[in-house]
Interface confidence: low
Amino acid sequence: TQNKALPENVKYGIVLDAGSSHTSLYIYKWPAEKENDTGVVHQVEECRVKGPGISKFVQKVNEIGIYLTDCMERAREVIPRSQHQETPVYLGATAGMRLLRMESEELADRVLDVVERSLSNYPFDFQGARIITGQEEGAYGWITINYLLGKFSQKTRWFSIVPYETNNQETFGALDLGGASTQVTFVPQNQTIESPDNALQFRLYGKDYNVYTHSFLCYGKDQALWQKLAKDIQVASNEILRDPCFHPGYKKVVNVSDLYKTPCTKRFEMTLPFQQFEIQGIGNYQQCHQSILELFNTSYCPYSQCAFNGIFLPPLQGDFGAFSAFYFVMKFLNLTSEKVSQEKVTEMMKKFCAQPWEEIKTSYAGVKEKYLSEYCFSGTYILSLLLQGYHFTADSWEHIHFIGKIQGSDAGWTLGYMLNLTNMIPAEQPLSTPLSHSTYVAHHHHHHHHHH
């Protein structure tokens, strides 16, 4: 008899990452009979939604439906029609929406309401849109990278999946940088997590993990830049701000009203004798670094050790995966190689920031000027945050791995979020038969809601 190809017994899931600067849709796929195994879920598609983050639609909520259309239609094409109805769709909004909610709960709810109504119109199994906490964002990012690196697998391998993978079961820490917040998450070495807000306990695949996590709201790269500008304009003697974080010859006019729009600049707000000011780049890495350091209050620490702003941080431990904007920025600057030391990165940043704006524009003609102009700041900010903020040193820098994808799946919180909400990370080691719902554990922490 002729061999007939059996239909693939696969499942799909969709997660929308509604970030502060943009929204991305991720489609995940996995073999149905292996959904409790570690490392079987993989990303098959990423669709970047054209336009800004959803928080920017606060005055034009009627445009949200159109905004989401292209990527949702793309999901319809990628996922076989027969599976549409059983494919879960989750939308998680992060720090951009956390900031909007701080300004007005009503406005944030209005945006989410329209998002939910738009997503409900598609033939998928829509599971809701919500603003995830910073703690969840950190935790799910940590789960994602360790799941993809095979750290939860009990089978030790004699080969490595990825170049920087150490062939042991020590988990990687997760460093996530967004536009509005940044997260640091790792398992400290025999260290008490002195602040309960920063402690998570997981039981995954039969093993207990005590995890430290913190999300610094307003310390994503875009909000950090707004903070820096608001701080520096306080001491400008007129409406010219000579800024070392922009290339020499770069000029841009900023509205003071835009500067003070975000809650992140409230602490620096003051009545200025002008409505607009002009940034004039002077391109000096060291001065830029010095200015950024002033955003980190290290003058008080109620714990044995702090990152900044009085937030507990245990001693760093093990290897770290740095993803999202940590990766995008360093990739653009060509600084993601494992061989590049921290000293070399600093030297390269000094040279890059000192390059005249006209030269930069010519060298990177294909890059949007808005993004291009901010790489000097962003690169310097990343160094400042990692070295002074999180206390990495020239030596421990070598334990930071700038990661875009692992095994074809983007590093980020979305995969971990879906794994949790679809109950695909069992608390105990999977048996040959799937376990009942009751044996699954999201995490023993009041901030986390397990979805059924």
Partner: antibody
């Protein structure tokens, strides 16, 4: 002409309190961060505290943390150092200095005022 | 905290002589260093900022230099008004820290 004038020094008993003012003139005081620095007799300079232009950032040396408070009144162009629980080791000449990144870091200093803590 | 180790603690030199004072930082300070002069009457004056930039009004015989974590102040030809105490200060991080000082005396 930039001028910084400290005053208010004197003799104080251990455990006592004193507030030192520093009057600024000749520049836009509200644009600048300000420092207090001290020098014990026959010793080197020791940084004490810093306050940013808008008072949003404040730092202290460990030796004075919890006892000294730096503050400013931008309307009156005056910097202050409130000192409490004074000890004999706080005996020193106290200087104020202005600070504005990038080229005005501690570029002008006052002439100093003397504090003596003794019973 | 960043320690600044200044040497020598005292130095006797003659008019017209060239002298160098050094400060070593215990951690990277990326050139965030100033040099100060304190006259016998207690007056303090900044000479150099950002490790090597001369303040306006400061004679050209003063110069600042950096070599790794070592920072130096050189006076190319001593004049009588240069005999004073000299301090370095790092402004890379808080707390700000001074070198122990160098007393420059006439030989």
């Amino acid at each position: 002409e930039v001028q910084l004038v400290e005053s208010g020094g004197g003799l104080v008993k251990p455990g006592g309190s004193l507030k030192l003012p520093c009057a600024a003139s000749g520049f836009t005081f509200s644009d600048y961060g300000m420092h207090w620095v001290r020098q014990a007799p026959e010793k080197g300079l020791e940084w004490v505290a810093y306050i940013s232009s808008g008072s949003s950032i404040i730092y202290y040396a460990d030796t004075v943390k919890g006892r000294f408070t730096i503050s400013r009144d931008n309307a009156k162009n005056t910097l202050f150092l409130q000192m409490t629980s004074l000890r004999s080791e706080d005996t020193a000449m106290y200087y104020c200095a202005r600070d504005l990144y990038y080229d005005h870091v501690l570029d002008y200093w006052g002439q100093g005022t003397t504090l003596t803590v003794a019973s | 905290d960043i320690q600044m180790t200044q040497s020598p603690s005292s130095l006797s030199a003659s008019l017209g002589e060239r002298v160098s004072l050094t400060c070593r930082a215990s951690q990277e300070i990326s050139g965030y260093l100033i040099w100060l002069q304190q006259k016998p009457d207690g007056t303090i004056k900044r000479l150099i900022y950002a490790a090597s930039t001369l303040d306006s009004g400061v004679p050209k015989r003063f110069s600042g230099n950096r070599s790794g974590s070592d920072y130096s102040l050189t006076i190319s030809s001593l004049e009588s008004e240069d005999f004073a105490d000299y301090y370095c200060l790092q402004y890379a991080s808080y707390p700000r820290t001074f070198g122990g000082g160098t007393k420059l005396e006439i030989k």
